[in-house]
Interface confidence: low
């Protein structure tokens, strides 16, 4: 199939964001101290507001049946055609895309329109391909598409394991959600980060915004306020705060370091889980709350984001002698975990190096060109190219391949920034083995 319907640009030009929004909104170091209760309440309210707005922004207008009539342009050198059109061979005319066959989402000088996606079997067509927007496909009822296997719809589980209770239904974008009866800990062990904002996904329209949603929102906000006050007054705050600040932002600037390798999931974790599960509105797809709690380490020492930052300080000499391996903090799939971080790379890699980097990683000219055409905007171009690389390379698309390519291009600063970012996001950690055994 040509291009996944889920990743296709929406009419608005926004493409699916995996996890949090732009980097500016989340990676910053903490500024002046503010009352702790306020931090939690504001974060919770923002979470609710953005969840609600995500529902609203997903409302699709009636599909436009025809694009604007053909338009003439003055000269080829400034010849751009509107969405729903492509430029003619001689550069003089704008030719309409064929409705239901192809499309173009931006003002462009494409010589032909992009081909519409055909939904796979097991998918339903949520909205048809128009001349200005690709088909939007969604998994059939009883199946879902998750981040780990975006190429296919998987069957939802029929029930929860023993000792667990269902708190979330099967949706086209998430499996049923189960939590432990006693603690409220999710079955997957995932802990959505409070600090993250939830952004909408063109590929996965949410259910319509309704009065009940607003009522739930207000109720949840009230509960959050009460819980926040309780937590603030309790002695557990000191244990909870590093999690809240560290899981998503990597604890940058936070003086309290949490040693994850020595910490066993226990009572403190359950308090956090309960707080977070209260904060999470049930309408928000589970998969969009992506930051995961690292599972208990098995056999190797996992370092906390805080410790990881200290690891970056030794001299270059040691760095060259021993290569430390970056591994997913949650023991998840390395390629998928890396993919979740692509959103921020546009801020870390200089624009001039985007194409050389992708060529170094093995993308061909037209793959780069198609990625550019599919991107929802300038900033999304690198993201789209990196996704193409992952789709093309599969399991071979490793964080080390990417870092090595940057090194080869002489982009050492960008390499360092990405390494730092992967660590501080809490998604990656250094693998510590016996002497050099774990080093490559």
């Amino acid at each position: 199939m040509e291009q996944r319907g889920q990743n296709a640009p929406a009419a608005s030009g926004a493409r699916k964001r995996h996890g949090p929004g732009p980097r500016e909104a989340r990676g910053a170091r903490p500024g002046p101290r503010v009352p702790k209760t306020l931090v939690l309440v504001v974060a919770a309210v923002l979470l609710l507001v953005s969840a609600e707005s995500a529902l609203i922004t997903q409302q699709d207008l009636a599909p436009q049946q025809r694009a604007a009539p053909q338009q003439k342009r003055s000269s080829p050198s400034e010849g751009l055609c509107p969405p729903g059109h492509h430029i003619s061979e001689d550069g003089r005319d704008c030719i309409s895309c064929k409705y239901g066959q192809d499309y173009s989402t931006h003002w462009n000088d494409l010589l032909f329109c992009l081909r519409c996606t055909r939904c796979d079997s097991g998918e339903v067509e949520l909205s048809p391909c128009t001349t200005t927007r690709n088909t939007v496909c969604q998994c059939e009822e009883g199946t879902f598409r998750e981040e780990d296997s975006p190429e296919m719809c998987r069957k939802c589980r029929t029930g929860c394991p023993r000792g667990m209770v269902k708190v979330g239904d099967c949706t086209p974008w998430s499996d049923i959600e189960c939590v432990h009866k006693e603690s409220g800990t999710k079955h997957s062990g995932e802990v959505p980060a409070v600090e993250e904002t939830v952004t909408s996904s063109p590929g996965t329209p949410a259910s319509p915004c309704s009065l009940s949603g607003i009522i739930i929102g207000v109720t949840v906000a009230a509960v959050v306020l009460i819980v926040a006050v309780f937590v603030c007054k309790s002695l557990l705050w000191k244990k909870v705060l590093p999690y809240l600040k560290g899981i998503c932002s990597g604890g940058g600037g936070d003086p309290e370091r949490v040693d994850r390798s020595s910490q066993r999931p226990g009572a403190e974790d359950n308090v956090l889980n309960e707080i977070v599960s209260i904060l999470q509105p049930t309408q928000v797809p589970e998969q969009e709350m992506e930051v995961q709690e690292p599972a208990e380490p098995t056999g190797v020492n996992m370092l906390s984001p805080g410790e990881s930052e200290h690891l970056l300080e030794p001299a270059e000499a040691e760095r060259s002698q021993r290569r430390r391996l970056l591994v997913p903090a949650n023991e998840g799939d390395p390629t998928e975990t890396l993919r979740q971080c692509f959103d921020d790379f546009a801020d870390l890699v200089p624009f001039d190096s985007w194409e050389p980097l992708m060529r170094k990683l093995g993308l061909m000219d037209n793959e780069i060109k198609v990625a550019k055409a599919e991107a929802a905007g300038h900033r999304d171009t690198l993201y789209t190219m990196l996704i193409k690389w992952v789709n093309k390379t599969g399991r071979d698309a490793s964080v080390h391949t990417l870092l090595d390519a940057l090194e080869t291009l002489g982009e050492r600063l960008a390499k360092q920034k990405i390494e730092d970012h992967l660590l501080s996001s809490g998604k990656f950690m250094y693998l510590e083995g016996n002497a050099d055994s774990a080093m490559s």
């Epitope: 050198s77 010849g79 751009l80 061979e89 000088d109 010589l111 000219d365 060109k369 905007g377």
Partner: antibody, heavy 129, light 107 residues
Framework: QVQLVESGGGVVQPGRSLRLSCAAS????????MHWVRQAPGKGLEWVAV????????YYADSVKGRFTISRDNSKNTLYLQMNSLRAEDTAVYYC??????????????????????WGQGTTVTVSS | DIQMTQSPSSLSASVGDRVTITCRTS??????LNWYQQKPGKAPKLLIS???SLQSGVPSRFSGSGSGTDFTLTISSLQPEDFATYYC?????????FGGGTKVEIK
């Protein structure tokens, strides 16, 4: 009218160098990617190299990589092919050709399709001792 | 590199005949395929680009189809001026490659 005129061909000994030129007229040269394509006597077409509208990217066929250099002077509307370490198998008619995609400086992207819509008449290069 | 296999390498046909030339690629190239016509002693001429997009000034008897690895150039009713050599060319990735050519001769 739109025209490409190659020059610089001739007979040259193996190991020697030669520089081909291609003068463009009738269109905005710096808006187009440009190619060199060659054809050995009695054989088919072989793509040699391409240069982007602004000279920022250059690609070569494996058979000429490291020996040939494509370049352009947009102020002179001229495309060049510097051929070093010439071999007998480089004997061919060399054509310059325009890429059919227009670069638009008001567009956020440059779409590169590599279809060659305007060709020169060709210049013959013979490598023989 | 992407290999291009054109068939047949030559064919004899009469005026008015329907002629079909095929081009197969060693890997999928989506629709990034162009067709050229070349007459003896002349430069090639672009007929069709992006598999099926007819160049301006090219008669409508020429048509192209296909996607992925298999492509076809069809001349619905052969005319005297159509006797020439036809080349396919992939534009998916560099190095760009041409097919070996198909020579269309008068029967």
């Amino acid at each position: 009218q739109v025209q490409l005129v190659e020059s610089g061909g001739g007979v040259v000994q193996p190991g020697r160098s030669l520089r081909l030129s291609c003068a463009a007229s009738g269109f905005t040269f710096n808006n187009y990617g440009m190619h060199w394509v060659r054809q050995a006597p009695g054989k088919g077409l072989e793509w040699v190299a391409v240069i982007w509208y602004d000279g920022s990217n250059k690609y070569y066929a494996d058979s000429v990589k490291g020996r040939f250099t494509i370049s352009r002077d947009n102020s002179k509307n001229t495309l060049y092919l510097q051929m070093n370490s010439l071999r007998a198998e480089d004997t061919a008619v060399y054509y310059c050709a325009r890429d059919r995609t227009v670069y638009s400086n008001s567009s956020p992207f440059y779409y590169y399709y590599y279809g060659m819509d305007v060709w020169g008449q060709g210049t013959t290069v013979t490598v023989s001792s | 590199d992407i290999q291009m296999t054109q068939s047949p390498s030559s064919l004899s046909a009469s005026v008015g005949d329907r002629v079909t030339i095929t081009c197969r690629t060693s890997q999928s190239i989506s629709t990034y395929l162009n067709w050229y016509q070349q007459k003896p002693g002349k430069a090639p001429k672009l007929l069709i680009s992006a598999t099926s997009s007819l160049q301006s000034g090219v008669p409508s008897r020429f048509s192209g189809s296909g996607s992925g690895t298999d492509f076809t150039l069809t001349i619905s009713s052969l005319q005297p001026e159509d006797f020439a050599t036809y080349y396919c060319q992939q534009s998916y990735s560099t190095p760009l490659t041409f097919g070996g050519g198909t020579k269309v001769e008068i029967k």
